[in-house]
Interface confidence: low
């Protein structure tokens, strides 16, 4: 006769508070007659999980039906998994007997242990914008989760970066862990629509990855261009300087006209053209009445933009 | 003689993972003759975790020496504490016999719960600034702390502040926890050396709460006021007018003088004198030549303030 | 570093007043109990009593009831104990403790302060 | 209230020697006992809470436990700056209540 196998196929069972555990266990052979029993432990002090014939489990399920004849699926259901529920479980055989029954083979065991899901990673960027061409660093957190293992991959606009540093901690044994990882991304002039992204795999997430994203608009400042040029004009004794000012990101614009130094006028941009990258362009002009001027002209388009110092482009006009 | 207790003084001991834990009994007799076991659960399937006669328990260790002849102390120490371990453990007394001794009376029971202490909590403030006599919201985040129980107090320079609300989730059994927490905060004109404190306390940490702090300059504009005055003048061709910008926060301020409308200047403040509450004062000066007006001259001094909408106070200049 | 600074040496006399104070730094004030204990010359340690600053909740030992008198000014973190009618007995260091808001083992009679040494004399 | 009996009240030893002292609880108080260190200038340091809690910062070379209603403090290997004033402390209930105190005298 076939030797009889104790089949408990998962070496480790990850659960979650609250859950239902399935511990599988099958057998190759109805013999030798006797009761298949689950104890978590070994040795004197193992603890009976799952008896059939006495005892009271209300926590605990059967797969299948033990009462039909050739049954050899002996699986249970643990439900409302605690903490206190963790430990190594044994599907164990006994032999009929008398008085009473006797071990006769035990499976390998089936290690239950606690998992938790990470939170949903939270992505934070600078504190202060900066220029395309410099570097800024990107913050990705995610806490709760349980067992440490865990894999984190940084995106911008779907490509991957190798350039960040990742810490899990607590170092030592811990009931749940958190990450922290920190991204340096090079920003360039086209950034304004680009986003990082955090990727958080765990075993908890059975393959769905939880993603954090952060917008490079909230981290990039694009300076404007700027370019003076004279209009025509019909009118004889004026002239039409226009100042455009391009590609530049955030919004906040103002512009001052000076005449050989001297403050013309004062603007702040608002109805602005938005080009495709996402910056913005803006156009100022200034009719100068070249009557009132005996000598040639420097105009200057000064303008400040987001706070930061201001950038500025001159014109000469000169008077025939 | 006296009836034997078994004295288990704690009802729960909280416990981290890796460290050791205590289980104290002691007992208030020596008879009956027998030994004193440790087990883990009731019934038929409670899990022995120490018989000094035999077995092997190598995490296990006695307080005092049970081979001495009068000790009435058998409490244990558990190294290396897992989330396996958690359960209630009971110190059971049994008689001596034969063939096999008799279980005589149980402790109470002590519960071995499992702690984690909350990560240092994380507090943050409003994106935008905004003015005194308004409210702002400040978070705090703490995470990874069991059991779930845990008191956030917020203050406000150490006085507690009462409109916030708290949420501690998941809201189920989890194997950790966080909090998460908003609190309301009207901003007064004195607030730019403020400070907002997250306190949080937790059994884990034994008496000394966490903090975390925001400071309120980051999340204040206190707009200036402005007065427009004319100073004496020795030449009498010019008038003095200085303009007074004062109790001001934060820096960035941009000053244009009009005359009768006309741009006549436009400076940014640089050199600023700061006031005890932290706030700025700043003055600017327009010379104004008399004689190029034959008319009265209406002086405006406008300031836009951290990007703000502009404000202004006008001087009406009398041209004698 | 949590720190309790006490006020310096008093010499008092009989019949009189005298008012201590106790500074706390380095954590908030309002999360303990500030408890005050009392050492004779030459003597062993007794507990007087603890107020709490939160709402000025005060637990007195029965002995020196009507003898201490427990206040405190939160907006300075700062504990004050005004022993009454002194009399030679009240000769002592006083020192302050103190223990956190929820009964936690850790929290109790952790940090002191050094003392502040009364001499009730003619 | 309750009382704590503190012994011996003095006690000479030498340097290395290890020596423990005592303090009964007059009810019971579970474990809510602690040891304190008071410096000659005064300066007063908790050891032990909880009975046998060893308080960050102080040598492995002091333990607390407890018999019943007897709780001890041992100093396995005495050091110079070990010879200094030790008093046991209840937070149990209402009034807290001291030891009377144990003096360590080197010999």
């Known amino acids: 006769e076939e030797e009889l196998q104790m089949i408990q196929p998962e070496k480790l069972l990850l659960v979650t508070v609250g859950k239902t555990a399935t511990l599988h266990c099958t057998v190759t052979s109805l013999l030798p007659v006797g009761p298949v029993l689950w104890f978590r432990g070994v040795g004197p002090g193992r603890e009976l999980i799952y008896n059939q014939k006495e005892g009271h489990f209300p926590r605990v399920t059967t797969v299948s039906d033990l009462t039909k004849r050739n049954n050899m699926d002996f699986s249970i259901r643990i439900s409302s998994i605690t903490p206190a529920d963790v430990g190594t479980y044994y599907c164990v055989k006994f032999r009929k007997g008398s008085p009473e029954n006797v071990e006769f083979k035990s499976g390998p065991g089936t290690e239950m242990a606690l998992g938790a899901k990470p939170s949903a990673p939270v992505v934070s960027g600078p504190a202060v914008r900066a220029t395309p061409e410099h570097t800024v660093s990107f913050t990705c957190e995610s806490h709760g989760f349980s067992p440490r293992d865990i894999t984190l991959k940084w995106f911008k606009n779907g490509n991957e970066l190798s350039d960040f540093q990742t810490n899990v901690d607590p170092a030592g044994d811990s009931v749940s862990y958190s990450i922290h990882s920190t991204a340096r991304v090079v920003l360039t002039r086209g950034d304004v629509h680009s986003q990082v992204i955090c990727e958080i795999a765990h075993i908890t997430l059975q393959g769905d990855p939880l993603r954090g994203t952060a917008n490079l608009s909230e981290a990039i400042r694009v300076p404007p261009t700027l370019e003076v040029t004279q209009q025509p004009m019909r009118a004889e004794n004026q002239a039409n300087v226009t100042c455009q000012v391009s590609n530049f990101y955030p919004r906040g614009l103002q512009l001052t006209w000076l005449e050989n130094g001297n403050v013309s006028r004062t603007e702040t941009a608002s109805t602005l053209i938005e080009n495709k990258d996402g910056t913005y362009n803006w156009m100022s002009w200034l009719l100068v009445n070249t009557c009132a001027h005996r000598d040639d002209v420097v105009l200057t388009c000064q303008v400040e933009h987001d706070g930061q110092q201001a950038v500025s482009k001159s014109y000469a006009l000169e008077i025939s | 003689e006296e009836e034997l207790q078994m004295i288990q003084p704690e009802k729960l001991l909280l416990v981290t993972v890796g460290k050791t834990a205590t289980l104290h009994c002691t007992v208030t007799s020596l008879l009956p003759v027998g030994p004193v076991l440790w087990f883990r659960g009731v019934g038929p399937g409670r899990e022995l975790i120490y018989n000094q006669k035999e077995g092997h328990f190598p995490r296990v260790t006695t307080v005092s020496d049970l081979t001495k002849r009068n000790n009435m102390d058998f409490s244990i120490r558990i190294s290396s504490i897992t989330p396996a371990d958690v359960g209630t453990y009971y110190c059971v007394k049994f008689r001596k016999g034969s063939p096999e001794n008799v279980e005589f009376k149980s402790g109470p029971g002590t519960e071995m719960a499992l702690g984690a202490k909350p990560s240092a909590p994380v507090v943050s403030g409003p994106a935008v600034r905004a003015t005194p006599e308004h409210t702002v919201s400040f978070t705090c985040e703490s995470h990874g702390f069991s059991p779930r129980d845990i008191t956030l107090k917020w203050f406000k320079n150490g006085n507690e502040l009462s409109d916030f609300q708290t949420n501690v989730d998941p809201a189920g059994d989890s194997v950790s926890y966080s909090i998460h927490s908003t609190a309301r905060v009207v901003l007064t004109r004195g607030d730019v050396h403020s400070q907002v404190i997250c306190e949080i306390a937790h059994i884990t940490l034994q008496g000394d709460p966490l903090r975390g702090t925001a400071n309120l300059s980051e999340a204040i504009r206190v707009p200036p006021t402005l007065e427009v005055t004319q100073q004496p003048m020795r030449a009498e061709n010019q008038a003095n007018v200085t303009c007074q910008v004062s109790n001001f926060y934060p820096r960035g301020l941009q000053l244009t003088w009009l005359e009768n409308g006309n741009v006549s200047r436009t400076e940014t403040a640089s050199t600023l004198i700061e006031n005890k509450d932290g706030t700025y004062n700043w003055m600017s000066w327009l010379l104004v030549n008399t004689c190029a007006h034959r008319d009265d001259v209406v002086l405006t001094c406008q300031v836009e303030h951290d990007g703000q909408q502009a404000v202004s106070k006008s001087y009406a200049l009398e041209i004698s | 570093e949590v720190q309790f600074q006490q006020s310096g040496t008093v010499l008092a006399r009989p019949g009189t007043s005298v008012k201590m104070s106790c500074k706390a730094s380095?954590?908030?004030?309002?999360?303990?109990?500030m408890h005050w204990v009392k050492q004779g010359p030459g003597q062993g340690l007794q507990w007087i009593g603890a107020i709490y600053p939160v709402n000025n909740d005060t637990t007195y030992n029965q002995k020196f009831k009507g003898k201490a008198e427990l206040t405190v000014v939160t907006s300075t973190s700062t504990a004050y104990m005004e022993v009454s009618s002194l009399t030679n007995e009240d000769s002592a260091v006083y020192y302050c403790?103190?223990?956190?808001?929820?009964?936690?083992?850790?929290?109790?009679?952790?940090?002191w302060g050094q003392g502040t040494l009364v001499t009730v004399s003619a | 209230d309750i009382q704590m009996t503190q012994s011996p009240s003095s006690l000479s030893a030498s340097l290395g020697e290890r020596v423990s002292l005592t303090c009964r609880a007059s009810?019971?108080?579970?474990?809510?006992l602690n040891w304190l260190q008071q410096e000659p200038d005064g300066t007063i340091k908790r050891l032990i809470y909880?009975?046998?809690s060893l308080d960050s910062g102080v040598p492995k070379r002091f333990s607390g436990s407890r018999s019943g209603s007897d709780y001890s403090l041992t100093i396995s290997g005495l050091e110079s700056e070990d010879f200094v004033d030790y008093y046991c402390?209840?937070?149990?209930?209402?009034?807290?209540?001291f030891g009377g105190g144990t003096k360590l005298e080197i010999n």
């Open positions: 380095g954590s908030t004030f309002t999360s303990y109990w």
């Open positions: 909880a009975t046998s």
């Open positions: 403790t103190r223990s956190f808001y929820y009964s936690l083992d850790a929290a109790w009679f952790v940090y």
């Open positions: 009810q019971d108080i579970g474990s809510r």
């Open positions: 402390l209840q937070y149990a209930s209402s009034p807290f209540t």
